[in-house]
C-alpha cells in the first residue's frame, strides 16, 4: 500500500492504491548536496548522475577505513525520497549529486559554497531546464551562505532546504534563514511537528512550510534493493524538492516567487497542532503541510498572496522592524503586531526601489513585528496615500483617488505613546470601499494599486466589546491582500493575515479592565484579478 | 604539500616588489566586517571566506588574494588560497592565521570576512 507520506502529499483525486500523479518531474534536474550516494540502488539507478564534485572535511576520530555503504546512507535515502521508483515523490525527475558531507554527515560552509558555485558554473556552461537544489543540511547562521543562496536564487534556481532538527528558531541556522530559500520543517503522520529524541523540527518565521518528515521509507545503502525508514527535516525538504520538480515540470516557466506561492497555496492549512511550538513562535510559524496541486492545470487564474513576518524589532523605544517581499512580489499591505500591545503602528516605505513594511515599537514595549502581505500580480503599480492625524472625533480617513487604483491595504502609524480609546466606535461609512479609516491621532496610509482587471472589496467584522481575537475571511475566489484593525486603540495587539483570514488580536480583556464601549473590528481587503481569470480561461 | 608551499614562496617573491608600495588602508569610509558562527563547537578557525564588494570585477578576486598573501608574507605568515569564487560571489577562501584578520579587513574591495564553520546532515 502507499506509504503514509506519499498519501499525505497527494490530493484526493489521485489517490488510488498506488501513488501515480501525472508528470513525474521529468523536465527538471534536482541537484542534491549531501553525502555520497549509492547510484546503483534499484530505487534511483539510471536517474542519478554522480558529479565529480567533492568538498568534504576529514572524518574525526574514526576507527576504521571508509565503507561506501555507510557513507552513502543519508544521501541515498534522500535521493530515493525525491525520485525513487517505488517510494519517491517525483519519479521522473533527474538527480545530480554533489558530495559536501563526509561519512559522519558533516561538511563545511566553504565546501558547500564551492558546491553551489559548481552548480552555477554548470548552469552557465550548459543551460538546461528548471533546476532545483536540495540542501538537506544546516549550520549556524551564516551571512556568506545566505548571500550565495540569494545569488543562485536570483539566477533562477529553486533552492529547498531543511529547517533543521534542533527544536529551535530556524532563523538561527543557515541556509534555513535565507529568505530566497524554501525552508521546510517536518511533520508526522498525525500532522504533529516531528520530535527527534530530545530535539525536533525547527520552527518560526523562517520556515516556509512543513512536509512529511517522520518514519519516511526510502532507499537504504545497505544493499541495492534495501529500504529503511528515516526521520528529519532533510526528509521533509526532499518531499518539497520533489513537489517543486513536479510543479516545474507542469509549468517550466514558473519563477521562484510563483513556485513558492503555489507551494503555500496548495498546502494543507491549519492541520498542525501548534501547541508543540513555543508560545512566542506559534503566530510566526506557518501552519502549512506541503501537497501536490490537485491537477496539472495551470493555476494562473489565482491571485496569490502570502504573509511575511519580519524579525523582532527588539525593545528599545525607537526600534523598528522591517518585512520585505521577494524580488518578484508586490507588497500590497502592511500591518504590525506586538505581544505587549505597545506599538506605534506601521507604514509602507520605499527602500532601494522596493516597497517595504516598517513597524514601530513604543516606549515600554517589548518590541514589534512588521507583517507584509506579498502578492503576485502582473503589471501592478502601487502607491501610498497618507492622511495626517485628523484630531477630530470622526477619526482619520484616506482613500485611493487615482483613476483605476483600488485599495489593497490600510496601515496606521502614530507618534503618541498610547492611543486613547475610541468612543463611540468608528465604523466605515457605507459606499466608500476605497477608504481607510483610523484613530484620530494616527496617520493613516492607504495602499492603492492598479493592475489589469484588479478589483477589491472591504470586508469588516466588528464586535462591540474587545475579544482576544476577531477574524474575518475572504470568500472563495477572492484573496486577502490587506488586514488591519479598526480603530487601532491601545488594547489591540495588532493584525495579521493567516492564509485568507484576517486576524486581529487584542489584550486579554480580564487583565486590561476594558469597557464595553471599546469596540474592535477586523478589516479585510479581498481582491481578485479579472485579468488573471480571463487568461486562465483562454489557456483552458 | 611541499610542492604547494614551494610554488607559494615563489609567488610571494614575485609579488613583493609589486605590492610593497600599496597602502594597507581600505578605500575611504569603507569598513569591512568580520563574522563567525554563534555556535562555538561548530566554528572552524583558520579558514576564512573573504567576500568582496558586489560590484567588484572578477579579476579583482585573484588580485586581492595575492595582495593578502604578499602582505601576510611580509609579516612572516604563511597563507594558502584554497579557492577563488567567481560565479556566485566575488571573493576567495583562504587558510591563514586569525592574527591576519585585521590586515585582511583593511584590504581594498573587501566587504566582509566570515570564518568557516560546520554544517550537518539533517
Amino acid at each position: 500500500s502507499i506509504p503514509w507520506n506519499l498519501e499525505r502529499i497527494t490530493p484526493a483525486r489521485y489517490r488510488a492504491d498506488e501513488y501515480q500523479p501525472p508528470k513525474g518531474g521529468s523536465l527538471v534536474e534536482v541537484y542534491l548536496l549531501d553525502t555520497s550516494i549509492q547510484s546503483d540502488h534499484r530505487e534511483i539507478e539510471g536517474r542519478v548522475m554522480v558529479t565529480d564534485f567533492e568538498s568534504v572535511p576529514e572524518e574525526d576520530g574514526t576507527r576504521f577505513h571508509r565503507q561506501a555503504s555507510k557513507c552513502d546512507s543519508h544521501g541515498t535515502h534522500l535521493a530515493g525520497v525525491v525520485s525513487g521508483r517505488d517510494a519517491g515523490v517525483a519519479k521522473g525527475a533527474g538527480l545530480r549529486s554533489l558530495r559536501v558531507l563526509n561519512c559522519q554527515g558533516k561538511g563545511t560552509v566553504s565546501g558547500t559554497l564551492i558546491g553551489l558555485e559548481f552548480i552555477r558554473k554548470s548552469q552557465l556552461v550548459q543551460p538546461v531546464g528548471p533546476l532545483v537544489v536540495l540542501l538537506p543540511l544546516a549550520g549556524g547562521y551564516s551571512r556568506v551562505f545566505n548571500a550565495a543562496c540569494q545569488r543562485l536564487a536570483r539566477a533562477g534556481v529553486v533552492l529547498v532546504t531543511a529547517a533543521g532538527n534542533f527544536r529551535d528558531d530556524a532563523c538561527l541556522y543557515s541556509p534555513a534563514s535565507a529568505p530566497e530559500v524554501i525552508t521546510v520543517g517536518a511533520t508526522n503522520a498525525q500532522d504533529q511537528p516531528v520530535t527527534l529524541g530530545t530535539l525536533g523540527t525547527n520552527f518560526g518565521r523562517c520556515v516556509d512550510l512543513f512536509a512529511p518528515g517522520e518514519d519516511i521509507i526510502g532507499a537504504s545503502s545497505d544493499c541495492s534493493t534495501c529500504f529503511v525508514s528515516r526521520s528529519g527535516t532533510s526528509q521533509a525538504a526532499a518531499h518539497v524538492a520533489g513537489i517543486a520538480a513536479m510543479m516545474l515540470s507542469a509549468e517550466p516557466e514558473l519563477t521562484l516567487a510563483e513556485l513558492r506561492q503555489r507551494l503555500i497555496h496548495f498546502s494543507a492549512k491549519d492541520v498542525i497542532n501548534e501547541a508543540w511550538f513555543p508560545e512566542d513562535q506559534r503566530v510566526l510559524t506557518p501552519n502549512l503541510v506541503a501537497a501536490l496541486p490537485p491537477s496539472t492545470h495551470r493555476a494562473g487564474w489565482q491571485l496569490f498572496c502570502r504573509t511575511v513576518w519580519s524579525a523582532h524589532s527588539g525593545p528599545t523605544r525607537m526600534a523598528t522592524a522591517v518585512a520585505r517581499c521577494a524580488q518578484d512580489e508586490e507588497l500590497l499591505s502592511c500591518s504590525s503586531f506586538s505581544r505587549s500591545g505597545k506599538r506605534r503602528g506601521e507604514r509602507i516605505e520605499a527602500q532601494g526601489g522596493k516597497r517595504v513594511c516598517r513597524a514601530h515599537n513604543a516606549f515600554g514595549g517589548e518590541g514589534v513585528y512588521a507583517i507584509a502581505r506579498c502578492c503576485l500580480l502582473p503589471q501592478v503599480n502601487c502607491s501610498v496615500h497618507t492622511a495626517p492625524p485628523a484630531g477630530a472625533s470622526m477619526g482619520t480617513r484616506v482613500h485611493c483617488h487615482q483613476q483605476g487604483h483600488v485599495l489593497t491595504g490600510c496601515s496606521s502609524h502614530w507618534e503618541v505613546e498610547d492611543l486613547g480609546t475610541h468612543k463611540p466606535p468608528v465604523l466605515r461609512p457605507r459606499g466608500q470601499p476605497n477608504q481607510c479609516v483610523g484613530h484620530r491621532e494616527a496617520s493613516i496610509h492607504a495602499s492603492c494599486c492598479h493592475a489589469p482587471g484588479l478589483e477589491c472589496k472591504v470586508k469588516e467584522h466588528g464586535i462591540p466589546a474587545p475579544q482576544e481575537q476577531v477574524i474575518v475571511a475572504c470568500e472563495d475566489g477572492w484573496t486577502l491582500t490587506g488586514c488591519s484593525a479598526l480603530p487601532g486603540t491601545s488594547h489591540v495587539l495588532g493584525a495579521y493575515a493567516v492564509d485568507n483570514t484576517c486576524v486581529v488580536r487584542s489584550r486579554d480583556v480580564s487583565t486590561t479592565g476594558s469597557t464595553s464601549e471599546e469596540a474592535v473590528a477586523a478589516v479585510a481587503i479581498c481582491c481578485r484579478s479579472r485579468h488573471l481569470v480571463q487568461a486562465s480561461q483562454e489557456l483552458q | 604539500q611541499e610542492d604547494e608551499d614551494g610554488d607559494y614562496e615563489e609567488l610571494v617573491l614575485a609579488l613583493r616588489s609589486e605590492e610593497d608600495g600599496l597602502a594597507d588602508a581600505p578605500e575611504h569610509g569603507a569598513t569591512a566586517t568580520f563574522h563567525r558562527c554563534a555556535k562555538d563547537p561548530w566554528r572552524l578557525p583558520g579558514t576564512y571566506v573573504v567576500v568582496l564588494k558586489e560590484e567588484t570585477h572578477r579579476s579583482q578576486s585573484e588580485r586581492t588574494a595575492r595582495r593578502l598573501q604578499a602582505q601576510a608574507a611580509r609579516r612572516g605568515y604563511l597563507t594558502k588560497i584554497l579557492h577563488v569564487f567567481h560565479h556566485l560571489l566575488p571573493g576567495f577562501l583562504v587558510k591563514m592565521s586569525g592574527d591576519l584578520l585585521e590586515l585582511a579587513l583593511k584590504l581594498p574591495h573587501v566587504d566582509y570576512i566570515e570564518e568557516d564553520s560546520s554544517v550537518f546532515a539533517q
Partner: antibody
Framework: EVQLVESGGGLVQPGRSLRLSCTAS????????MHWVRQTPGKGLEWVSG????????NYADSVKGRFTISRDNAQNSLYLQMNSLRAEDTALYFC????????????????????WGQGTTVTVSS | DIVMTQTPLSLSVTPGQPASISCRSS???????????LYWYLQKPGQPPQLLIY???NRFSGVPDRFSGSGSGTDFTLKISRVEAEDVGLYYC?????????FGGGTKVEIK
C-alpha cells in the same frame, strides 16, 4: 509504545561465543544510536558498546574491545552483539538500550543518553 | 575514563519526606555546546533502569514533578520532594560527555 526485547543469552563456557539480539518496536529504529549495557552485582552498570544509525561510528568499552562486535540491521529493526572469547567476568545481565538523542551519523550529536532499556538477557560464562 | 561517585550508598526515607542524592564526576561534564551531560536513572526491583532526568535538570516524559535535578560542572544532585512508596529502588547517575559512558555506583532508596 517503545519496546526493546533482548534474546540469545544463556550459559556458555569460557572462550566460547554467544550472539545477543535485540528487536525494537514503537519507534523509527534507524533514527537512533543503539547501545549494549551490562549489569553485574559486583560492578554495577557498565556500558559495553554503541553504534550509530548507519553503523559508521562504533565504540566499545576497553574491557570488550577486540572480542565483542556490535552490529545492526535497520530493515529488521534489530541490534546484535557478537561475543567471542568469553570470560567469567563477562557474566552479567545484558541490556539493549535506545539513545535519547536523534542520531544523524555523528553529525552534531557527540553525546549520548539512554532513554529506553529492554528487560535484559542473562549471560553466564562458567565451566 | 570519567569516574562517577555517588553518595550516600543507601537512604531510608519516611513517605512524604524529601530525599537528596549527590553525584560527583572526576571532570567537568560541561560541553562546549553549553550543555551538561549528566543523567539520572531509577532501577526498580526486577526492572531495567528508567530515565528520570537528562542533561542535569530536564525531566524525561512521564516523570513526576517531585523529581528534580540540579548542579553544574562536577557536582550534581537529584532531589525527591516527597518520597512515595513507588520510588524505592537503585538510583544511578551517568555521564555522557565522553565515551565510555560511565555510571555511579548507585544509591539504594528504601522506605522507613
Amino acid at each position: 509504545e517503545v519496546q526493546l526485547v533482548e534474546s540469545g543469552g544463556g550459559l556458555v563456557q569460557p572462550g566460547r561465543s554467544l550472539r545477543l539480539s535485540c528487536t525494537a518496536s514503537g519507534f523509527t529504529f534507524a533514527d537512533y544510536v543503539m547501545h549494549w549495557v551490562r549489569q553485574t552485582p559486583g560492578k554495577g552498570l557498565e556500558w559495553v558498546s554503541g553504534i550509530s544509525w548507519n553503523s559508521y561510528s562504533i565504540n566499545y568499552a576497553d574491557s570488550v574491545k577486540g572480542r565483542f562486535t556490535i552490529s545492526r540491521d535497520n530493515a529488521q529493526n534489530s541490534l546484535y552483539l557478537q561475543m567471542n572469547s568469553l570470560r567469567a567476568e563477562d557474566t552479567a545481565l545484558y541490556f539493549c538500550a535506545k539513545d535519547i538523542t536523534y542520531d544523524l551519523l555523528t553529525g552534531y550529536n557527540y553525546n549520548y543518553g539512554l532513554d529506553v532499556w529492554g528487560q535484559g538477557t542473562t549471560v553466564t560464562v562458567s565451566s | 575514563d570519567i569516574v562517577m561517585t555517588q553518595t550516600p550508598l543507601s537512604l531510608s526515607v519516611t513517605p512524604g519526606q524529601p530525599a537528596s542524592i549527590s553525584c560527583r564526576s572526576s571532570q567537568s561534564l560541561l560541553h562546549s555546546d553549553g550543555k551538561t551531560y549528566l543523567y539520572w536513572y531509577l532501577q526498580k526491583p526486577g526492572q531495567p533502569p528508567q530515565l528520570l532526568i537528562y542533561e542535569v535538570s530536564n525531566r524525561f516524559s512521564g516523570v513526576p514533578d517531585r523529581f528534580s535535578g540540579s548542579g553544574s560542572g562536577t557536582d550534581f544532585t537529584l532531589k525527591i520532594s516527597r518520597v512515595e512508596a513507588e520510588d524505592v529502588g537503585l538510583y544511578y547517575c551517568m555521564q555522557s560527555i565522553q565515551l565510555p559512558l560511565t555510571f555511579g555506583g548507585g544509591t539504594k532508596v528504601e522506605i522507613k
